[in-house]
């Protein structure tokens, strides 16, 4: 049995509430903390030893419609002289997140949860494979 953390309470549905089909819910697409301040990035995507670019992907049948994906700019990593060292590897850092997929069934519209793999940035790693001649 899960115990709520301090300051948390589990929602208890009153017994008088009508029953809802299992696995479905009512959804408010308004966002809590919508104006939360994002800390300054200070261009870390350019200053990193494994720099990356951002691309905005757009899908009108997904919520959120806009998802930002990162792409590693290099195969290797950038050394102190600004040169690419291919004996180190730039690799993507990925986060699996849930989005809502809009489904049209006749006149009704519903949403289904969908897993989405988001690349948030890149990092530099030592290679696991060393070529032996």
């Amino acid at each position: 049995q899960r115990v709520p953390k301090e300051g948390q309470t589990f929602f208890q549905k009153p017994e008088s509430c009508p029953s809802v089909p299992e696995g479905s819910l009512k959804l408010d697409l308004g966002i809590i903390n919508a104006n939360q301040r994002v800390p300054l990035s200070r261009n870390i995507e350019r200053r990193s030893t494994s720099p990356w670019n951002y691309t905005v992907t757009w899908d009108p049948n997904r919520y959120p419609s806009e998802v930002v994906q990162a792409q590693c700019r290099h195969l290797g990593c950038v050394n102190a002289q600004g040169k690419e060292d291919i004996f180190m590897n730039s690799v993507p850092i990925q986060q699996e997140t849930l989005v809502l997929r809009r489904k049209h069934q006749g006149c009704s519209v519903s949403f289904q949860l969908e897993k989405l793999l988001v690349t948030v940035g890149c990092t530099c790693v030592k290679p696991l494979i060393h070529h032996v001649h």
Partner: nanobody, 123 residues
């Protein structure tokens, strides 16, 4: 998972050109390093080159630099190999490959491979 399908192979005369394509489907294409290998009859698989997720960084095997050009179009989930001044010794099955780490791909240890497309250079 990522599925890779090569196309564009065929018979070409010496000195001719050919452009191979590799269509990817599945997970985010732009998060993968992608590249090309080839395998001539009776020989080991040989690394041709690779390109970073954004397409800004390209690495070629020394032997192929100049004649072969690798590019990618992330909006089309496609990798390309432009081959010029083809010679009979370029006859091989050409494979497209993908991995999140260049070090794995470079030494033929990629997670994903296409089925290959045959290129024959002959008069």
């Amino acid at each position: 998972d990522v599925q890779l399908v090569e196309s564009g192979g065929g018979l070409v005369q010496p000195g001719g050109s050919l452009r191979l394509s590799c269509a990817a489907s599945g997970r985010t294409f732009s998060s993968y390093v992608v590249g090309w290998f080839r395998q001539a009859p009776g020989k080991e698989r040989e690394f041709i080159g690779a390109i970073s997720g954004s397409g800004e960084s390209i690495y070629y095997a020394v032997s192929e630099k100049g004649r072969f050009t690798i590019s990618r179009d992330n909006s089309k989930n496609t990798l390309y190999l432009q081959m010029n001044s083809l010679r009979p010794e370029d006859t091989a099955v050409y494979y497209c490959t993908a991995d999140q780490e260049f070090g794995y791909l470079r030494f033929g240890r990629s997670e994903y491979w296409g089925q290959g497309t045959l290129v024959t250079v002959s008069s």
